[in-house]
Interface confidence: low
């Protein structure tokens, strides 16, 4: 996607977590929320659209409670002052999960997307364009927080003729680079620095009727399968990859494959067939020993919203899941530059892919 | 090589004010959580402060809460704590260290800096 | 804030001896619990991170389990290089805090 002006996603941030938005809510403008909910640590937690930091000024205010069976309440709070309350009696989330949580602000409401589907719709009670600031807390630990600014410009041709059976994400923009703002990412860590967040674009006709979003959309936004796309610059220390999606229910296994060449320099293979996250390189179409240890049980779940954040490192590559260090896998092939296509297939929908 | 490297710290009196650097090197300084932590003469470790200099997010414990500030260069990958209106309490061994992600505790430690506050 | 309560605050044991420390937290965790050694006059050093994950470099007499709240560090068979200061920290939610140390002393 081309992403001109929007800024860099929050990692890892703690919670309770204040942030800026920058340039401001805008129409079009996607919000992702990435995170797992907390087994027992209280009952609720929230995402705030707000004015500054006090908490005073909250345009809207979402947030899921684990109580009475479980519910959604949508608000909005001015000068101190919480207004009616409107609530959702089914609770998408579920405590101990990861989810997917999609924001898209339109020009009459927020749309909410839990795990690639739509949940509610929260109209606007306030002017939007005086939120600059996203909060989040509560029983939730965050993968991350990502942006995607609806300032796009088409790059290159949609796929087209891909089935697909449910909807993922927002419709999206188009592909293409994205300067990342002053000041956010660091000063010198390597050569090229640009971000490509990747969506699905093209095939008739949209769900959500939005002038700053191209014509030409999937129905049911999915991405292709498999999905390659380049890795712009390659691999190089301070490189983060982001990947989330949701495992298919009847899944056996899926890959996240970084490539160099036709090798793979780094293969991520869960298998659920034999409960185990499998990780090797093939150079030559051969294939080396297997990495298989894990300091806690299977984090992949059949049927379940998963998020994977691949950080490069000058010795390796260091993944997270769900929010949770995993492991580190030493490079095996070293001419980091080099790997620089990736490529994922296997029994999973993707919702959000940035490299 | 992985290096964190503290200084700053010296003998200050009550009210006044000192400023701690934590200079890393051998990592991609953005990409970790930068913690403070210090430890009183005979006594355990408390977390005082951190930051996530890629996004410059900052957190603080209450006890600091006011007085200090964490702050990072990424173009030097330094971290500093800026500590004003000390107070007798706030003497203790401060060093700095590293965390990966949101869940991985605390990898590397700098040797420390000992901060003493005292008319 | 989360407390996290260790015990004991000090044992005294002898080389080859098995040891085991616990913190137990006082609310929800997960597993985002380390495990640190701290020697007089030295920075800590990270054991085990996520409750139970060797932390590269670390001998594998140390290993840390998880039962719900309450975390636990073992020492297999204790080394004259084992004597320290041991802490527990969680990481979960702000702020991080740190177990009260146990102390581990030759009999």
């Known amino acids: 996607m081309a992403f001109s002006g929007s800024q860099a996603p929050y990692l890892s941030p703690a919670v309770p977590f204040s942030g800026t938005i920058q340039g401001g809510l805008q129409d079009g403008l996607q919000i992702t929320v990435n995170g797992t909910v907390l087994s027992s640590s209280g009952t609720r937690f929230a995402v705030n659209f707000q004015t500054g930091f006090s908490g005073n000024d909250i345009a809207f205010h979402f947030n899921p409670r684990f109580e009475d069976g479980g519910y959604v309440v949508c608000n909005t709070r001015q000068n101190g002052s919480w207004g009616p309350e409107e609530r959702k009696t089914h609770m998408p989330f579920q405590k101990g999960m990861p989810f997917d949580l999609c924001f898209l602000v339109q020009s009459s409401d927020f749309k909410v997307m839990v795990n690639g589907i739509l949940f509610v719709q929260y109209f606007h009670r306030v002017p939007f364009h005086r939120v600059d600031t996203i909060s989040v807390n509560g029983s939730v630990q965050l993968s991350y927080i990502s942006f995607q600014n609806p300032r796009t410009v088409p790059v290159q041709p949609a796929f087209s003729t891909v089935p697909f059976s449910q909807p993922v994400c927002f419709p999206p923009r188009p592909r293409g680079r994205r300067q990342k703002p002053p000041g956010v990412w660091p000063a010198n860590p390597a050569p090229i620095t640009q971000t490509v967040i990747h969506t699905v674009q093209s095939a008739p006709g949209q769900m959500f009727s939005t002038p700053a979003i191209p014509p030409m959309m999937y129905p049911h936004p999915a991405y292709p399968m498999p999905f390659i796309t380049t890795i712009l610059g390659g691999l190089y220390p301070s490189k983060s990859i982001l990947l989330s999606g949701t495992v298919l229910p009847s899944a056996q296994r899926f890959h996240i494959n970084l490539c160099s060449g036709n090798h793979i320099a780094f293969h991520l293979n869960p298998r659920f067939d034999e409960n185990a996250v499998v990780r090797n390189t093939q150079i030559d179409n051969s294939w080396g020993s297997e990495e298989r240890s894990l300091p806690r049980k299977m984090p992949f779940v059949r049927g379940q919203s998963f998020s994977v954040w691949i950080l490069c490192e000058a010795h390796c590559l260091k993944v997270a899941v769900d929010g949770q260090h995993l492991f580190e896998y030493y490079h095996r092939l070293r001419n980091l530059p080099t790997i620089n296509r990736l490529e994922v297939g296997g029994d999973i929908q993707l919702t959000h892919v940035q490299t | 090589e992985v290096q964190l490297v503290e200084s700053g710290g010296g003998l200050v009196q009550p009210g006044g004010s000192l400023r701690l650097s934590c200079a890393a090197s051998g990592f991609t300084f953005s990409y970790y959580w930068i913690h403070w932590v210090r430890q009183a003469p005979g006594k355990g470790l408390e977390w005082v402060a951190d930051?996530?200099?890629?996004?410059?997010?900052?957190y603080y414990a209450d006890s600091v809460k006011g007085r200090f500030t964490i702050s990072a260069d990424t173009s030097k990958n330094t971290a500093y704590l800026q500590m004003n209106s000390l107070r007798a309490e706030d003497t203790a061994v401060y060093y700095c260290?590293?965390?990966?992600?949101?869940?991985?505790?605390?990898?590397?430690w700098g040797q420390g800096t000992l901060v003493t506050v005292s008319s | 804030d989360i407390q996290m309560t260790q015990s004991p605050s000090s044992l005294s044991a002898s080389v080859g001896d098995r040891v085991t420390i616990t913190c137990r937290a006082s609310?929800?965790?997960?597993?985002?619990v380390a495990w640190y050694q701290q020697k007089p006059g030295k920075a800590p050093k990270l054991l085990i991170y996520?409750?139970?994950s060797l932390y590269s470099g670390v001998p594998s007499r140390f290993s840390g389990s998880r039962s719900g709240t309450d975390f636990t560090l073992t020492i297999s068979s204790l080394q004259p290089e084992d004597f320290a200061t041991y802490y527990c920290q969680q990481y979960a939610l702000r702020p991080l805090t740190f177990g009260q140390g146990t102390k581990v002393e030759i009999k």
């Open positions: 609310q929800s965790v997960s597993s985002a």
């Open positions: 930051i996530y200099p890629s996004s410059g997010y900052t």
């Open positions: 260290a590293r965390g990966w992600y949101a869940a991985y505790g605390m990898d590397y």
């Open positions: 996520s409750a139970s």
